[in-house]
Amino acid sequence: SLLPVPYTEAASLSTGSTVTIKGRPLACFLNEPYLQVDFHTEMKEESDIVFHFQVCFGRRVVMNSREYGAWKQQVESKNMPFQDGQEFELSISVLPDKYQVMVNGQSSYTFDHRIKPEAVKMVQVWRDISLTKFNVSYLKR
Amino acid sequence: SLLPVPYTEAASLSTGSTVTIKGRPLACFLNEPYLQVDFHTEMKEESDIVFHFQVCFGRRVVMNSREYGAWKQQVESKNMPFQDGQEFELSISVLPDKYQVMVNGQSSYTFDHRIKPEAVKMVQVWRDISLTKFNVSYLKR
């Protein structure tokens, strides 16, 4: 069954945590649907964003952070492992120095930590996708 | 009650027709939600687009056409009559020489016809909005 989109969930992250998302683009790639995943510092959507991950399907991925309300230096990738019309599985792992983004089991993007991952309080998944799975796995202490 | 998004409806347009849309952005303007309205030449979403109207809430509006699968010259406007968090009523009227876009009763954008409006067979409303009303009014013959 489908999860509501935008989908918002409280989360605490640290090295070893992984966020897993399963979904499908709502439109063909010609129409440039988007997927966005934001790691927020508060439960409010206006809060700062520790890690912003935005896919324009078929075109590009941009990653960034929003600090004290201002967007910082954008990182762009043309790598496009997503398939037109196909379900995707996205996993974002918190490594000691960066986020590692896997798409369908394949390491596809990395983003160096700008803000401590421990600052994350909420994850939001939204834009032009249907969502079937959202999970945060925590490292066993 | 809410209409499904993306929302797709068969439509035939000509001078005097008006498409009316009522909805609300799904996120605060800081997060740049989008609204998109596309007038397609076929019932298929990959078909050409006679009039493409995309709002990046709080930032800008772009209008364009997609002809033989290729995007043409984009028209951009910084006019932003939409209100953060507020419901909007959008009406797109087919005038003899252009589309006139009204937002909350106020004339806000125009787009000169590049393709005959009679070529439109389907309207799609999508991206980051909830949709409460969609109506196509036809000129009484």
Epitope: Q73, D97, H113, R114, A119 | -
Partner: antibody
């Protein structure tokens, strides 16, 4: 071994210009963000400017914005700081520094020995 | 943009523990780095990402942070540790901020 060597400092009148250079060796220069940090006589460290690996993104402290321009030539392994409309308060020892990586908090792991800029009439 | 405040001077007896604080930063948010600077020399990175120690830095140097305070601890201070120490925090690019500096005297 890894080295950063600044040059181009000197005495200049208020309103004048200088161009500082920082020659890098012993590491893959094009893979690192680079920075200018200054230290006025008897004072603390002040971050001045930053440039990303490709040189397409540049950042400045408010105190120098609009007057200073950071740039780099990755083919020559050299970092630059063009300083215009100099003021007496720009008088300082100017260091070039390398970031440990693009990761926040890795700090500036290598520094040059600095080049002195004196703005005085 | 945070302003980082450090005490202007700290004294410690030889072999004792020195603690230098850095206040006013959002250290739940941003990492802190620490630099040592001796007279006439360039700064040297002694702590990065709150508590990381670069190779070649003695184990007696350690760092921690909590809330709005970061602390550099020198356990068993040596005469050669007498220097100015600066904290630095902020993001990776355009908002790096240095504290005002603390002079450590080893008695």
């Amino acid at each position: 071994q890894l080295q950063l060597v600044e040059s181009g400092g000197g005495l200049v009148q208020p309103g004048g210009s200088l161009r500082l250079s920082c020659a890098a060796s012993g590491f893959t220069f094009s893979s690192y963000w680079m920075y200018w940090v200054r230290q006025a006589p008897g004072k603390g460290l002040e971050w001045v400017s930053a440039i990303n690996t490709g040189g397409g993104s540049t950042y400045y402290a408010d105190s120098v914005k609009g007057r200073f321009t950071i740039s780099r030539d990755n083919a020559k392994n050299t970092l630059y700081l063009q300083m215009n409309s100099l003021k007496p308060e720009d008088t300082a020892l100017y260091y070039c520094a390398r970031a440990g990586s693009g990761v926040a908090g890795t700090g500036y792991d290598y520094w040059g020995q600095g080049t002195q800029v004196t703005v005085s009439s | 943009q945070p302003v980082l405040n450090q005490p202007s001077a700290v004294s410690v007896s030889l072999g004792q523990t020195a603690r230098i604080t850095c206040q006013g930063g959002n250290f739940g948010y941003y990492y802190v780095s620490w630099y040592q600077q001796k007279p006439g020399q360039a700064p040297v990175l002694v702590i990065y990402r709150d508590s990381g120690r670069p190779s070649g830095i003695p184990e007696r140097f350690s760092g921690s942070s909590s809330g709005d305070t970061a602390t550099l601890t020198i356990s068993g201070a040596q005469a050669e540790d007498e220097a100015d120490y600066y904290c630095q925090s902020g993001s990776s690019s355009d908002n790096a901020v240095f504290g005002g500096g603390t002079h450590l005297t080893v008695l």
